[in-house]
Interface confidence: medium
């Protein structure tokens, strides 16, 4: 789940030794802490967009924010596959792409994201309230799935209202070399915390009670990003009416790499690759969910009719595995 995490606002320090600089050094650790924590959890984002040119044509884009080797992506609609969902496409980096009507074109956009265009006519064409789900298999993080649908009252060509606040994107940060920054930041954070050890701990207060207090925002991954390590997932169900947020029991687990000293996702791709990937809009994705995802015995064949072979755009399993890599 991508929840918008409000980094707790700190009480302004009492006048004296700290002053303005002290205030900044107190806020900085919380921002760094948020980055250090949020960068370590794999997650999936889903973006659904109705094309302006063809009102019944949809583009679904999905991405995986993790550092493992992605080896399989399935896109389904009507819910998770096996829980009423129907497979639209299966993308395998080495063995090809397979798609079923009304899917028109499935393709890899980057080494960690895919897009799927759906035909817009006939009985099988999607309604604006259709839920689309993407599931990624990654070694060593495991299977991760998210679902999304078109935001309510979206204008054609728009995926969701633009996000109103500056966002610290874990994925973009990773692409831009956040690994080094985070390592430095985490070390600096420890240094700051040690420096402040002899001072009384700053009092935390919810940011909503102090609108004047500085706030930092970050996209917080679903698991392992909060202190409790378990956050309920949210399903955004637009169903052609204002979105509702349903919270269910927490599940899902920490990733294989959550315990590493540096949490940054390694994404060996150039600016051109990530620049073409728009920021997933807030209303268009939901949590990593656990459930019945694939029909029993419905594993796609490795070869056969309908299989479009293509060269691996990422190189031979290009993404770096985070643990025990020799």
């Amino acid at each position: 789940m991508r929840t918008e995490a409000q980094v707790p606002a700190l009480q302004p320090p009492e006048p004296g030794l700290e002053g303005a600089m002290g205030h900044r050094t107190l806020v900085l650790p919380w921002v760094l802490l948020t980055l250090c924590v949020t960068a370590g959890t794999p997650e999936v984002w889903v973006q659904v967009r109705m094309e302006a040119t063809e009102l019944s044509s949809f583009t679904i884009r999905c991405g995986f924010l993790g550092s493992g080797s992605i080896s399989l992506v399935t896109v389904s609609w009507g819910g998770p596959n096996g829980a009423g969902g129907t497979t639209l496409a299966v993308l395998h980096p080495e063995r090809g792409i397979r798609q079923w009507a009304p899917a028109r074109q499935a393709r890899w956009e980057t080494q960690s994201s895919i897009s799927l265009i759906l035909e817009g006519s006939g009985a099988s064409s999607p309604c604006a309230n259709t839920t689309f789900c993407c599931k990624f298999a990654s070694f060593p993080e495991g299977s991760w799935e998210a679902c999304g649908s078109l935001p309510p009252s979206s204008d054609p060509g728009l995926s969701a209202p633009p996000t109103p606040a500056p966002i610290l994107r874990a994925d973009l940060a990773g692409i831009l070399g956040v690994s080094g920054v985070l390592l430095f930041g985490c070390v600096y954070l420890l240094h700051l915390l040690r420096r402040h050890k002899h001072r009384p701990a700053p009092r935390l207060q919810p940011s909503r009670t102090s609108p004047q207090a500085p706030r930092a925002r970050a996209w917080a991954p679903s698991q392992a990003s909060q202190a409790a390590l378990h956050v309920p997932y949210a399903t955004i169900n637009t169903s052609c009416r204002p979105a509702t947020l349903d919270t269910a029991h927490p599940h899902g687990g920490p990733s294989w790499w959550a315990s590493l000293p540096t949490h940054a996702a390694h994404r060996p791709q150039g600016p051109a690759a990530w620049a073409s990937t728009p920021i997933p809009a807030r209303g268009s994705f939901v949590s990593v969910e656990n459930g019945l995802y694939a029909q029993a015995g419905e594993r796609p064949p490795h070869t056969g009719p309908g299989l479009t072979l293509f060269p691996d755009p990422r190189g031979p399993r290009a993404m770096e595995g985070p643990l025990g890599v020799r």
Partner: antibody, heavy 120, light 106 residues
Framework: EVMLVESGGDLVKPGGSLKLSCAAS????????MSWVRQTPEKRLEWVAT????????YYLDILKGRFTISRDNAKNTLYLQMSSLRSEDTALYYC?????????????WGQGTSVTVSS | QIVLTQSPAIMSASPGEKVTMTCSAS?????IYWYQQKPGSSPRLLIY???NLASGVPVRFSGSGSGTSYSLTISRMEAEDAATYYC?????????FGAGTKLELK
């Protein structure tokens, strides 16, 4: 038909070394992650190590890192496990297994196992 | 590491009987995999991603669960189902297995 055949198991003294092999056939070996899993005399299963299809990424059980090395030769369709500084607790039946990514990396095929006994 | 606790350790069932065994994780995991091992044989994949039947597995087997609690059910026990069943997770490092549930024919 997918087949995995392990070999190389033996009786070795503590501190000794051993290299296990797993000959694969019936599938495109280089496309699959492969693992070694061992089964103790008490019948407990313990994951040992995993290697990516291209051999460029390896993953180990922490307590074995440094002593065990997983490798593969895709030209020979063979998976290896080099074990050194062997201890009595390494005594087990060692299986090689294939990770099927269409089954979300479950280990869908296992070999028959090769027995390693570490004893003085 | 995540510890998977299987219960019961040993159970017996008569042919035609419904059998349910559980796998409890020490902390939340995304999915559970189930393997069947008969004496003298290597493990065989039964269920992947909690609820999906592996190729060739009879439909009498089913899996369910989420978070820390998972189960494997055999709707109607058959003689050939007598075996040890292991659950496995790999949402968290390292990949771990449960100690197994031995299912005997009554």
């Amino acid at each position: 038909e997918v087949m995995l055949v392990e070999s190389g198991g033996d009786l070795v003294k503590p501190g000794g070394s051993l290299k296990l092999s797993c000959a694969a056939s019936g599938f495109t070996f280089s496309s699959y992650f492969m693992s070694w899993v061992r089964q103790t005399p008490e019948k407990r299963l313990e994951w040992v190590a995993t290697i990516s299809g291209g051999g460029d990424k390896t993953y180990y059980l922490d307590i074995l890192k440094g002593r065990f090395t997983i490798s593969r030769d895709n030209a020979k369709n063979t998976l290896y496990l080099q074990m050194s500084s062997l201890r009595s607790e390494d005594t087990a039946l060692y299986y090689c297994a294939r990770h099927e990514d269409y089954a979300w990396y479950a280990m869908d095929y296992w070999g028959q196992g090769t027995s390693v006994t570490v004893s003085s | 590491q995540i510890v998977l606790t299987q219960s019961p350790a040993i159970m017996s069932a008569s042919p035609g009987e419904k059998v349910t065994m559980t796998c409890s994780a020490s902390s939340s995991v995304n999915y559970i995999y189930w393997y069947q091992q008969k004496p003298g044989s290597s493990p065989r994949l039964l269920i992947y991603d909690t609820s999906n039947l592996a190729s060739g597995v009879p439909v009498r087997f089913s899996g369910s669960g989420s978070g820390t609690s998972y189960s494997l059910t055999i709707s109607r026990m058959e003689a050939e189902d007598a075996a040890t069943y292991y659950c496995q997770q790999w949402s968290s490092y390292p990949l771990t297995f449960g100690a197994g549930t031995k299912l005997e024919l009554k």
